[in-house]
């Protein structure tokens, strides 16, 4: 999906109002310095591409993020403010249903959510030069 036509300011507002808090709740009890940020993004569409991938694509050691509240709200924000996004997710949803696992918070999931926090922060500062 091409995130170029999303309403970035509305997505930013949703992030600042709630998704950020849900991410913090998920990470509660974890030191902010515990994980190094290894995933980066260069502009808002790229950030949303990376955010979608990390939030919804199961990875080795972390298959359970899609059912978290921050993930549901992320998906809603993309569906509401990115024209045509929902239509692109139908096939992905069918695949997800086949491999859904019960929610388990692993260290790998905490690391992944830490990466997500970094991507969202970058999304909110689009004018900053890439380090």
């Amino acid at each position: 999906y091409d995130f170029t036509n999303c309403d970035f300011e509305k997505i930013k507002a949703a992030y600042l109002s709630t998704i950020s808090k849900d991410l913090i709740t998920y990470m509660s009890g974890t030191k902010s310095t515990e994980f190094n940020n290894t995933v980066s993004c260069s502009n808002r569409p790229h950030c949303l591409t990376e955010i979608q991938s990390l939030t919804f694509n199961p990875t080795a050691g972390c298959a359970s993020l899609a059912k978290e509240m921050f993930a549901m709200k992320t998906k809603a924000a993309l569906a509401i403010w990115c024209p045509g996004y929902s239509e692109t997710q139908i096939n992905a949803t069918q695949a997800m249903k086949k491999r859904r696992k019960r929610k388990v918070t692993t260290n790998k999931c905490l690391e992944q959510v830490s990466q997500l926090q970094g991507l969202w922060r970058r999304f909110n500062r689009p004018l900053l030069k890439q380090q």
């Epitope: 509401i80 024209p83 929902s86």
Partner: nanobody, 117 residues
């Protein structure tokens, strides 16, 4: 002050249908995303569906896709949730929210939906 009032809940048999309504006052309806959350006993609150009345874009949780339909009537300042093919696992208190990220002051009091034979 924003007020959201849900109605339409009740007891229904599995496979049955219900239509929930959310009447809003104190806000310009078409400029806000309207959402429905639900909370089953002993479970976390879940975002079920949301609609942007201005763009007519919608979100549905995977668990309700194809069974639930959200709509909005800007002239009546009301959002609707049509629930078909109801399952026992749909039993919950359903809450309407102005903007799916809104704080507690922008929530209704909830309406109970019970799916049981």
């Amino acid at each position: 002050e924003v007020q959201l009032v849900e109605s339409g809940g009740g007891l229904v048999q599995p496979g049955g249908s219900l239509r929930l309504s959310c009447a809003a006052s104190g806000l310009t309806f078409g400029t806000h995303v309207m959402g429905w959350f639900r909370q089953a006993p002993g479970k976390e609150r879940e975002l079920v569906t949301a609609i942007n009345p201005a763009a007519l874009t919608t979100y549905y949780a995977d668990s309700v896709k194809g069974r639930f339909t959200i709509s909005a009537d800007n002239s009546k300042n009301t959002a609707y949730l049509q629930m078909n093919s109801l399952k026992p696992e749909d039993t919950a208190v359903y809450y309407c929210a102005r903007d799916f990220w809104s704080a507690g002051d922008s929530w209704g009091q909830g309406t109970l939906v019970t799916v049981s034979s």
